[in-house]
């Protein structure tokens, strides 16, 4: 997270760290007791790695009573996701067992009504991604509030030049932005999950390159079918 600040500890009980061989790789969001939603691109190079999900964490390194690492039983990428595009960049991870719920571990309601979030709405994005262009990684969860940007502006030739589909949404990126390591994490508007940080290699913090988020409401049928 660029231009953000440390989050209040355990105030985002839905927040997940998707890890490979014990290292944070991407964010994720607990959407059901046994399921975490993330981005499909996150794990494409984990061919011989052990994928696990950390729940109930604020610090990645320090012991915390609510922290628990879960193995992954199944990883279900959206069937139309591909490594060469950010379209359909969603992944559902089935935990090896139901998460132990409590004040610091709780699923987040996700948007089912397929309607664009009003431009200008302030939404919260959180993650353990880099906090500087130098690549400094935080140990504690960071967050930032970002205004939603209308799709027409986001699709300008000077911005994302038509790449933003109806199934994506944008947020402003003027010095405050999601960045590398935040991919797969949640964009939360009014207490509801609206978007998932896409995992392309986009430049961060440049206002001409707004943050791109996959709209979960657009994938309600797929999410429901996997969770069923």
């Amino acid at each position: 997270i660029l231009g953000g600040r440390e989050a209040e500890a355990h105030a985002r009980p839905y927040m997940a760290s998707v890890q490979v061989n014990g290292e944070h790789l991407c964010g994720g969001v607990l959407v059901a007791e046994q399921w975490v939603l993330s981005a499909a691109h996150c794990l494409e190079d984990a061919a011989d790695g052990k994928v696990q999900v950390l729940l109930g964490a604020h610090s990645l390194s320090q012991p915390e009573p609510s922290k628990r690492l879960y193995d992954v039983l199944r990883a279900v990428p959206h069937p139309d996701s591909r490594p060469d595009t950010i379209d359909h960049d969603l992944l559902l991870l089935q935990l090896s067992e139901k998460a132990t719920l409590g004040p610091a571990v709780r699923p987040l309601p996700w948007q089912r009504v397929d309607r664009d979030v009003e431009p200008g709405t302030l939404c919260d994005v959180a993650g353990w991604g880099i906090v500087s262009h130098a690549g400094r990684r935080p140990d504690r969860l960071q967050h930032v509030l970002l205004p939603v940007l209308d799709r027409a502006t986001c699709n300008r030739r000077t911005h994302h030049d038509g790449a933003i589909t109806q199934r994506m949404m944008c947020a402003e990126s003027n010095r405050r932005d999601s960045c590398k390591g935040d991919s797969g994490g949640p964009l939360v508007c009014g207490g509801v999950l609206e978007g998932v940080v896409t995992s392309g290699s986009r430049v961060c913090g440049n206002r001409k390159k707004p943050g791109i988020y996959t709209r979960v409401a657009s994938y309600a049928a797929w999410i429901d079918s996997v969770l069923a």
């Epitope: 794990l43 190079d45 061919a47 790695g49 052990k50 193995d71 992954v72 490594p83 090896s96």
Partner: antibody
Amino acid sequence: EVHLVESGGDLVKPGGSLKLSCAASGFTFSRYGMSWVRQTPDKRLEWVATISSAGSYTYYPDSVKGRFTISRDNAKNTLFLQMSSLKSEDTAMYYCARPLNYYGTSSFDYWGQGTTLTVSS
Amino acid sequence: QIVLTQSPAIMSASPGEKVTMTCRASSSVSSTYLHWYQQKPGSSPKLWIYSTSNLASGVPPRFSGSGSGTSYSLTISSVEAEDAATYYCQQYDSSPNTFGAGTKLELK
């Protein structure tokens, strides 16, 4: 429906080389890490190689490291296994296998029909 | 590397009988990374049970899997003729991933 079809198996002399292919269909091949697994004449199964979805990372057991090379062509939905310095103990049925979990570290939920390599003088 | 030892190597059962085969690991394996395959003569292996106890698609509910640490098992509650096959366990908890030598189930 997922289909994996191996080809290229042959009779090769010790020290020789051979390249196996696996044509994949019915799924987004470029999204999956892929593996080769072999079955020796005494019916033992042995993992041979794994490659990440984009082909950036490859993994091998010590028994084939330095002699075998796994590669892929995502544009053609094809997986390869280049084998060199072949030994008699490489004689086996070679299967192309797709993992249940797309990144690779998991069980294999789809297997091809196999192609046979015989190394003998 | 982790060595998986399957026992018995060969077993014989009558239809309707309950059978259990075991897979022992030379060191502890997480239950998430222990899998079973079924193979019939002339066919490729088929994923049968993944992550210790989860039946793969199309596997009859008479099959079950259990275990933890270094000891795992596959059980058939009431054997049927079509279950005659060789069953292999596999671990992917530590690299290299390895397979057991198999248990061949024959029907009387």
